[in-house]
């Protein structure tokens, strides 16, 4: 009888673990959908604001070609950094080329010096592939140096003139990016 009760208890515990796992997966999926939704809204908001703003970039943002960049003065973990950018109608920095990387690192040298700045790069937990926030892969020359030994989720950041990786749950400055507004004149 005792063995029977023990077996039932173990089965119940196993069921509970499976339900917890399912709930965790659902929560992650929901968060991912919410972020994608915000991502689209950010670009919509950015496009619409062109009707009310003649300057290509907002105050305190730096312009380079078609992009505007904001270098934060606050520390956040990676996910919060992304949310902070979304609030500004932007996303975490997505580095498309060596030229853009050089511009960013050159600007950082002038502004702040050698600090850590989150960018919109994270490592897929299953495949281990590096992905930008829009789902694209970085070009081979823009892959983070494997510095993080973290068992947790790993995200990319810029320091000096390097792209590095770290546990996403550490606090760093961050860089936001959005399209510069085209002059209507």
């Amino acid at each position: 009888k005792l063995l029977q009760v023990s077996t039932i208890a173990m089965q119940q515990q196993e069921k509970l673990i499976q339900q917890e796992r399912a709930l965790l997966n659902f929560t992650e999926w929901k968060r991912s959908c919410a972020l994608q939704m915000k991502y689209c809204q950010a670009f919509m908001q950015n496009s619409l604001s062109s009707a009310h703003n003649s300057s290509p970039c907002p105050n305190n943002w730096i312009q380079n070609r078609e992009s505007c960049y904001y270098v934060s003065e606050i520390w956040s973990i990676w996910h919060t950094s992304q949310e902070n950018c979304l609030k500004e109608g932007s996303t975490l920095l997505q580095i498309e080329s060596k030229e853009e990387m050089d511009f960013i690192t050159g600007s950082l040298r002038k502004i702040k010096g050698s600090y850590d700045y989150w960018v919109g790069l994270s490592q897929d937990g299953h495949s281990g592939r590096w992905l930008w926030q829009d789902g694209s892969s970085p070009s081979p020359g823009l892959l983070p140096a494997e510095r993080s030994q973290s068992a947790n989720q790993v995200c990319g950041y810029v320091k000096s003139n390097s792209l590095l990786s770290s546990n996403c749950s550490t606090w760093k400055y961050f860089i936001c990016e959005k399209y510069a507004l085209r002059s209507s004149v």
Partner: nanobody, 126 residues
């Protein structure tokens, strides 16, 4: 913009105590959470302790629980970190931090964003 000025750092023997202070200016101090971070050479920044705007809610890293106490004086616009039973592994630069506007998640200090001071060095020798 928030200005934060830390003081009270220094060198101390293992087992000793230090009290860090942080004077804040530039906005209404009593409306925001405050925190202490630390960073040792070659290590990631670590949230050591945090306190809600009212002082009613606090957070401590496991490594300092029972040894460190965070407190605040809203009348004086100051936050404190009392550090007792110091260990060599507590050696780091300690940064005072003020919650950024609009980042409030009640009770969850981890996901908030923070302005920070210049830092004060704490060295614990064995």
């Amino acid at each position: 913009q928030v200005q934060l000025q830390e003081s009270g750092g220094g060198s101390v023997q293992a087992g000793g105590s230090l009290r860090l202070s942080c004077a804040a200016s530039g906005r209404t101090f009593s409306s925001y959470a405050m925190a202490w971070f630390r960073q040792a050479p070659g290590m990631e920044r670590e949230l050591v302790a945090a306190i809600s705007w009212s002082g009613g809610s606090t957070y401590y890293a496991d490594s300092v629980k029972g040894r460190f106490t965070i407190s605040r004086d809203n009348a004086e616009n100051t936050v404190y970190l009392q550090m007792n039973s110091l260990k060599p592994e507590d050696t780091a630069v300690y940064y005072c931090a003020a919650e950024a506007e609009g980042s409030g998640r009640e009770g969850n200090f981890y996901e908030r964003s923070w302005y920070q001071g210049q830092g004060t060095q704490v060295t614990v020798s064995s």
